[in-house]
Interface confidence: low
Amino acid sequence: LIIGFGISGRHSITVTTVASAGNIGEDGILSCTFEPDIKLSDIVIQWLKEGVLGLVHEFKEGKDELSEQDEMFRGRTAVFADQVIVGNASLRLKNVQLTDAGTYKCYIITSKGKGNANLEYKTGAFSMPEVNVDYNASSETLRCEAPRWFPQPTVVWASQVDQGANFSEVSNTSFELNSENVTMKVVSVLYNVTINNTYSCMIENDIAKATGDIKVTESEIKRRSHLQLLNSKAS
C-alpha cells in the first residue's frame, strides 16, 4: 500500500494505491483511491507512467479528456466514472501488454487540494492449472496443465501423504510457446501415483502462484484450483 500526500501542507489530500499485476491480453485494474469531493466537476484525475511522454489517462470536469493521452494507451483506458465522486480513481486497462509494466502515478486534484501516489505494475501471464488423471499412460499418472504463463514458472509437485517428499525425479515438466510467441503452456506429468492421496501441482513465477489439487481415491476424483497474485502491496 502506498499512501501519498500533496506537496503543499494544508492543501494536500491523501491518495492511496495498491501495487498489482496485469495478465497480458486481458483487462487489468490499477487501483487508486482518494479523499472524495462533493463536486464531480472539481475533481481531476491524471494517470502518468514513468518514461512515457503523454498521459496514461485524464479525467476532468466529469468526463475523460484524452487529447494528451499517449498513443500506447489510446483506446485502452477507462476510469469508473460513477465511482469518482466517492473517491475511486482506479483505472481499467484493456488488453494488458508486457510493455505496460512499470511505475504509474495517480495524481489527484480536488477543491481540497492535491495529492499523488505511485503504483508498481507488473505484467505477465498466469492461469489456473487443471490436474487430471492421465489414463493414456501405462501406469497411473497425473497431468497438470495451465494454458498461459510468463515469465517461465517453476512447477513443484507435493502430496498430502508424503509431505516434504521431492517429486522431481518422478515428474516431467515441459513449456510450450503459445501462438503469440510470448506466453507458454505449462504441462507437468507426475508418475507413480498412489491412490487415497491428495496431490498438488504448484506453478509459480514472480507475479503469481497457482495450485491445482487432485484427490485420488478408489471411488472418486476431486479437483480444486486457486490462484494468488504475489505482489499486491498497497501504497
Epitope: D64, E65, S67, E68, E71, R74, R76, N95, T99
Partner: antibody
C-alpha cells in the same frame, strides 16, 4: 531516419478501384498508429481514417466520407500501410498522404503523397 | 463530432508584420496542433500540444489557447513563412483526427 513513401496512384475511371501503398522505414512500424490523409486540388486536408498499433489490436477507424468504400490494412512484416479504394468517384481525386501519429495525437511524419485522378 | 473553423481563410500580410491565425472548435478541446504546408509539398508539423514548437520551427512562431479557441502567432513575418497553416485536434469520442480548413498566408 524515418521515411514514408507512398505509391500506387494514377488515373482511374469512376467506379474503379485502386490500391495505394505506403512503405515505411526508420522506426518500429508496429508500435505506431498510421493514417491516410488526402487533399483535393486547392482544398484542405481530410483524414480518411487510421489504423491502430499492435498494443491496440490494429483496429481501424474510418471517416464517414469513405466508410464502406475504402479499406485500410497494414503488413507489419513489410513495414507497410495500404489503402484499398473501391467504387471511386470523381470527388476522390486528390493527393493521398500516409502519416504517422507521433504518440501525442498529431502527425510527426508524412509521406510525399501520391496523386489519384478519377475521371472518365 | 468536433469541427474546427479557421479564420481568416486568407490573409495578406507584409514581411515584418505580426500575424495571428485563429482556430475555433465546436466544443471544448484540451489542446491543438498546427501544420505548415507549402504548394506541392507535404504538411509539416509546426506546433504541437497548443504551444510546443516542432523541431526546427523558428521562435517567432508561438501557439496558445484553451477551451474552444486557439491561436498561432507569427511575431514578425518572414518570406519563408508564406504558406498555408492548418490546425488539427484529436477527439476520443468518436476517435478521430480533425483538421481545420486552413489559412493561406500570402504576400501583400
Amino acid at each position: 531516419e524515418v521515411q514514408l513513401v507512398e505509391s500506387g496512384g494514377g488515373l482511374v475511371q469512376p467506379g474503379g478501384s485502386l490500391r495505394l501503398s505506403c512503405a515505411t522505414s526508420g522506426f518500429t512500424f508496429s508500435d505506431y498508429y498510421m493514417s491516410w490523409v488526402r487533399q483535393a486540388p486547392g482544398k484542405g486536408l481530410e483524414l480518411l481514417g487510421f489504423i491502430r498499433n499492435k498494443a491496440n489490436g490494429y483496429t481501424r477507424e474510418y471517416s464517414a466520407s469513405v466508410k464502406g468504400r475504402f479499406t485500410m490494412s497494414r503488413d507489419n512484416s513489410k513495414n507497410s500501410l495500404y489503402l484499398q479504394m473501391n467504387s471511386l468517384k470523381t470527388e476522390d481525386t486528390a493527393v493521398y498522404y500516409c502519416a504517422r501519429d507521433s504518440h501525442r495525437t498529431y502527425f510527426d511524419y508524412w509521406g510525399q503523397g501520391t496523386t489519384v485522378t478519377v475521371s472518365s | 463530432d468536433i469541427q474546427l473553423t479557421q479564420s481568416p481563410s486568407f490573409l495578406s500580410a507584409s514581411v515584418g508584420d505580426r500575424v495571428t491565425i485563429t482556430c475555433r472548435a465546436s466544443s471544448s478541446v484540451s489542446s491543438m496542433h498546427w501544420y505548415q504546408q507549402k504548394p506541392g509539398k507535404s504538411p509539416k508539423p509546426w506546433i504541437y500540444a497548443t504551444s510546443n514548437l516542432a523541431s526546427g520551427v523558428p521562435s517567432r512562431f508561438s501557439g496558445s489557447g484553451s477551451g474552444t479557441e486557439y491561436t498561432l502567432t507569427i511575431s514578425s513575418l518572414q518570406p519563408e513563412d508564406f504558406a498555408t497553416y492548418y490546425c488539427q485536434q484529436w477527439s476520443s469520442n468518436p476517435p478521430m483526427y480533425t483538421f481545420g480548413g486552413g489559412t493561406k498566408v500570402e504576400i501583400k
